[in-house]
């Protein structure tokens, strides 16, 4: 008999795909709960455990966590399994803000700046590496240079533009070497002339239910790459959208509940109600993903009196054109995931 998660959903913080043969079962079904729910200390959320069985007090910063004993989501905690390789069974609750990064086998701390090579300056933020170029891509003058080419020059870090004339003899593309700064000169130029960069939002971390989407942006006073995150919910897990597809149709691109609703997050309720749109599903092997969306700020009020706000993906329109092995799994063909950064901000 099946003891696996429903195929249309993904864990909020999936453990890495490693050897899990020795992983203990923390969830036991049928559910077994204590006679009465626990009383949680002030400020600790009373939540349903990760097995969807019993009420439990959410694990706090530094506490052990498992598939069953989950970290307090409204405190911005997640379960860091990195210290339990290769089982990834027991983790430690950590701040989402404090996740380190690994790049080319080297581990960097959250907030740490480093230069993996002479061409980039990078910063580790919340598990994501954001890099800014030290080599400015100065475009060659097009009028007098019919065949521009970037070449490596011995002793210089950054490539330089050269112009190949008809005699195939390379020459510099500008009279006064303006296209070739060395690394130090380019750092100064970078700080004088910050190139604003905001990456596209990453796909939602779950194909249904509450997930997280992130992006890197250096649009700030320091011109420093920072990770932004927002909550996302592509479609509810507990609504069978297939039943809403009209006869003769294969897809329902957008699903919108009739009634407005309040968002809930770890027992906290949004201070106003919303009528969100969700992406639908297809009967065939296509996926539906957002293509017109924006980010809104949602304020939450908690039973203990605390309040907080979160950025949330607001879907305006979806399209159903991606091929995928599981119609609800946007990760199946992530390599071909289109970049809608221009229209999905």
């Amino acid at each position: 008999t099946a003891l696996s998660p429903a195929p249309t959903t993904m864990d909020f913080t999936p453990a890495p795909l490693e050897d899990t043969s020795s992983r203990p079962q923390f969830c036991k079904w049928p559910c077994e709960c204590p006679p009465s729910p626990p009383r949680c200390p002030l400020g600790v959320s009373l939540i349903t455990d990760g097995c969807e069985c019993c009420k439990m007090c959410a694990q706090q910063l530094g506490d052990n966590c498992t598939e069953a004993a989950i970290c307090d989501p409204h405190r911005g905690l997640y379960c860091d399994y990195s210290g339990d390789r290769p089982r990834y069974a027991i983790g430690v609750c950590a701040q989402v803000v404090g996740v380190g990064c690994v790049l080319d086998g080297v581990r960097y701390n959250n907030g740490q700046s480093f230069q993996p090579n002479c061409k980039y300056n990078c910063t580790c933020i919340d598990g994501a590496v954001g890099c800014t170029p030290l080599c400015l891509r100065v475009r060659p003058p097009r009028l007098w240079c019919p065949h521009p080419r970037r070449v490596s020059i011995p002793g210089h870090c950054c490539e330089q533009w050269v112009c190949e004339d008809d005699a195939k003899r390379p020459r510099k593309t500008a009279p006064r070497d303006t296209g070739a700064f060395d690394a130090v000169g380019e750092v100064e130029a970078w700080h004088r002339n910050c190139i604003a960069y905001t990456s596209p939002w990453s796909p939602c971390s779950t194909s249904c239910g509450l997930g997280v989407s992130t992006r890197i942006s250096n649009v700030n006073a320091q011109c420093w790459p920072e990770q932004e995150s927002r909550l996302c919910n592509l479609r509810p897990c507990d609504v069978d959208i297939h039943t809403l597809i009209k006869a003769g149709k294969k897809c329902l691109a957008v699903y919108q509940p009739e009634a407005s609703m309040n968002f809930t997050l770890a027992g906290c309720i949004s201070t106003r109600s919303y009528q969100p749109k969700y992406c639908g599903v297809c009967m065939d092997n296509r996926c539906c993903i957002p293509y017109k969306s924006k980010t809104i700020d949602v304020s939450f009020q908690c039973p203990d009196g605390l309040g907080f706000s979160r950025q949330v993906l607001w879907i305006n329109a979806c399209f159903c054109n991606l091929s995928c092995r599981n119609p609800n799994d946007i990760f199946a063909d992530l390599e071909s995931y289109p970049d809608f950064s221009e229209i999905a901000n």
Partner: antibody, heavy 121, light 107 residues
């Protein structure tokens, strides 16, 4: 009061499909696991499938695995059972039942009145 | 799958009698067993949960006992409305399984 009402039962040909619904009222639907249980004419009760409160975990009896799909819509307080490749052995009254997980797992504390599914040519 | 064997499969008794129905599990299920009453054309109704706890609203003449593999349902002082079929259910592990039923008839 707490109530479960099944619908969708019908006469269907072998190999055919049918979708049962169960409408719930009188309790917080999204707090409970829900199940389908069936009873062939003149026979005993047989558990069919269970689904967790937010559809993340699902369990099936071996006899229906790969043919039946349980689902729920918490916004509509509804439970569903999609039945495909039906055979005469699936002829039964189908009950939806609420699992009592409020204070440990204690089986089914609330049942619907049942809906009859007949598979015959 | 855990098998539940009920005995007897049918039983004749008179109003006022004390009757006992037994349910035996093929392996230990702790106290994860319930008893259900079903009347013709009706849905089952839970009488006992956790082997010995009485469902609210159920008359106290119904009682349950046992743990592990042996369980009993006792009705002390049968009433006319008690004539029905009784099932035990184990919910210790999936798949949930029911006993084959005990039909209680008027003598």
């Amino acid at each position: 009061q707490v109530q479960l009402v099944e619908s969708g039962g019908a006469l269907v040909q072998p190999g055919g499909s049918l979708r049962l619904s169960c409408a719930a009222s009188g309790f917080t639907f999204s707090d409970h696991w829900l199940s389908w249980v069936r009873q062939a004419p003149g026979k005993g009760l047989e558990w069919v499938s269970s689904i967790s409160s937010s559809s993340r975990y699902i369990h099936y009896a071996d006899s229906v695995k790969g043919r039946f799909t349980i689902s729920r819509d918490n916004a509509k307080n509804s439970l569903y059972l999609q039945m495909n490749s039906l055979s005469a052995e699936d002829t039964a009254v189908y009950y939806c039942a609420r699992e009592d997980t409020s204070m440990a797992t204690n089986g089914f504390d609330v049942w619907g009145q049942g809906t009859m599914v007949t598979v015959s040519s | 799958a855990i098998q539940l064997t009920q005995s007897p499969s049918s039983l004749s008794a008179s109003v006022g009698d004390r009757v006992t129905i037994t349910c035996r599990a093929s392996q230990g299920i702790r106290n994860h067993l319930g008893w259900y009453q079903q009347k013709p054309g009706k849905a089952p109704k839970r009488l006992i949960y956790a082997a010995s706890s009485l469902q609210s609203g159920v008359p106290s003449r119904f009682s349950g006992s046992g743990s592990g593999t042996e369980f009993t349902l006792t009705i002390s002082g049968l009433q006319p409305e008690d004539f029905a079929t009784y099932y035990c259910l184990q919910h210790n592990s999936y798949p949930f399984t029911f006993g084959q039923g005990t039909r209680l008839e008027i003598k």
